[in-house]
Interface confidence: low
Amino acid sequence: QLSLPSILPNENEKVVQLNSSFSLRCFGESEVSWQYPMSEEESSDVEIRNEENNSGLFVTVLEVSSASAAHTGLYTCYYNHTQTEENELEGRHIYIYVPDPDVAFVPLGMTDYLVIVEDDDSAIIPCRTTDPETPVTLHNSEGVVPASYDSRQGFNGTFTVGPYICEATVKGKKFQTIPFNVYALKATSELDLEMEALKTVYKSGETIVVTCAVFNNEVVDLQWTYPGEVKGKGITMLEEIKVPSIKLVYTLTVPEATVKDSGDYECAARQATREVKEMKKVTISVHEKGFIEIKPTFSQLEAVNLHEVKHFVVEVRAYPPPRISWLKNNLTLIENLTEITTDVEKIQEIRYRSKLKLIRAKEEDSGHYTIVAQNEDAVKSYTFELLTQVPSSILDLVDDHHGSTGGQTVRCTAEGTPLPDIEWMICKDIKKCNNETSWTILANNVSNIITEIHSRDRSTVEGRVTFAKVEETIAVRCLAKNLLGAENREL
């Protein structure tokens, strides 16, 4: 952090004799510059030069060869790199007075005679004297106006609208300024800016409309920045609404939009005081033609448990707005005949959410479900298979004697979704079959026993076990199981 530059002479203010020369030296730890009262056109007799010295500091000298009333004002020495357009200069100051008996007031530019007052704020009427000792009075149409005076700034106070004149007497001679005109304007310390784009997505040929509204301000410039600006594509309009309060509504219209008009649309408002700025932007996208995107939140094979309540949610992005419908096994879903409902809600401008709701899932709800979204430019669909999961149950367990061969087959029919697995167990000691430890799993690797399994349809399975020869009484158990449960039966 650099310390502030220093100025010689080391004074806050200095009175310089008319037509005499004076110089100001600025010392800094980095390169320094001067800001002084006159504009570049008026400053032909101001010379600024750099000076070498042995202190290791940077030295810049401001020299005035012949001081005049116009040289009265604030001289600021600042570091070059600290200057920004936004902020007041940070540096060291000295105020120079050059009293001139013929020029009581420091000459001003025409715009300085326009004093903008925002609401009931205080303002400065900038009549500055060339001599700090000169008494000054402020007058309007009603007479002398009481206001505090500072010869460096002028009169500070709360002024009503109208013309004001500063009056001074120097050595018995009376001087008057030309009138300062005070204007009252509706303005706020912060810009209340609102942007509205009823749509942010368009397709070729449509008209883009964006509005920006500024509230409680009359003193605003609003600039639009948008992709088609370089081609002058936009039409801007301004509407001033005064009731119930002041509101400036700026509208940008871009007709016959193309894909190239996609991008950021920005409105930047700035107050005429040049200090208060506010900006808002919106991203607009223009598509060659309408589109649809379907994004399901589930897979193409879904399962629901029997009697369960389940929702299937599909996100749809589409423009123009789509019509959304559901099919089951390629037929339109008739909701009032089933405990299935569908709905569509708009989430955002081009985002929709459609839900398929199963109230109490039944076996017959299984099938292929399709969501179809369509608009004038596109059609998209998504199909998934729904399985209603049913716990396994044994429908039938029977045996079949092979007659003289002494062989025997046992058939076990079971159902469930997913399709159940069938396992066989045997108990060779009938008296002990009540004890679970007496049961053993029948292995397929036993040579004289064959086990098979067949599915009859989507949910029914048949298991068979064939004994080549049964020499003693045994008990056989069929165990059918799937994800949701198991059931067994014995023979």
Epitope: S39, E40, E41, E85, I116, Y183, L185, N217, E218, V219, V220, D221, Q223, W224, T225, E229, V230, G232, G234, I235, T236, M237, L238, E239, E240, L248, A268, R270, A272, R274
Partner: antibody
């Protein structure tokens, strides 16, 4: 006090490009305002050509948009007009002008002296 | 584009007279109208903005009125220095457009 000064060739051949420069003194073109080109045809009709704002954004008259480009050189405090494929219809006095916006309304408050451009073979 | 029609295209009046120039917009431009004065061989100068507001330094004999599509510029007590062409310009929407001008001469 801000001053604007146009410069450029007084004579341009048809189908060639017209290039003009506006040099601004007394005010930085990046500080504020919109910096415009306006032309006045021999019959005295005025036409707004386009602008470049303090931020560098531009806006053009749609009747010229396929042929026009307004750019700037902030280091020289200048802004430029380039008009391509000129015809005799582009013969005019070209003004650069500053657009002010006090009191919630914009208008051209400072104008350059103008430079006359003749399109002729 | 918004068309701006000025009438009359030329006008001859005596010193001290009051004259009126009208400007008609092809669509509603609210109060977004500016008047400029261009003296012979000179550049256009801002006269009146927002239909009725006098620019700083413009004599009070100049006045503007109107809103919507119809606007007038009135010069009372005509002075020799008022010899000029007067233009209206709309600021309602891009592109900004000017009227054809009214040339004022002194009889």
């Amino acid at each position: 006090d801000v001053q604007l000064q146009e410069s450029g060739p007084g004579l341009v051949k048809p189908s060639q490009s017209l290039s003009l420069t506006c040099t601004v003194t007394g005010y930085s073109i990046t500080s504020d305002y919109a910096w415009n080109w306006i032309r006045q045809f021999p019959g005295n009709k005025l036409e707004w050509v386009g602008y470049i704002s303090y931020s560098g954004s531009t806006s053009y008259n749609p009747s010229l948009k396929s042929r026009i480009s307004i750019t700037r050189d902030t280091s020289k405090n200048q802004f430029f007009l380039q008009l391509n494929s000129v015809t005799t219809e582009d013969t005019a006095t070209y003004y650069c002008a500053r657009r002010d916006y006090r009191y919630g309304y914009w208008y051209f408050d400072v104008w350059g002296a103008g430079t006359t451009v003749t399109v002729s073979s | 584009d918004i068309q701006m029609n000025q009438s009359p295209s030329s006008l001859s009046a005596s010193l001290g007279d009051t004259i009126t120039i009208t400007c008609h917009a092809s669509q509603n431009i609210h109060v977004w109208l500016t008047w400029y004065q261009q003296k012979p061989g000179n550049i256009p100068k801002l006269l009146i903005y927002k239909a009725s507001n006098l620019h700083t330094g413009v004599p009070s004999r100049f006045s503007g009125s109107g809103s919507g599509t119809g606007f007038t510029l009135t010069i009372s007590s005509l002075q020799p220095e008022d010899i000029a062409t007067y233009y209206c310009q709309q600021g309602q929407s891009y592109p900004w457009t000017f009227g054809g001008g009214t040339k004022l001469e002194i009889k």
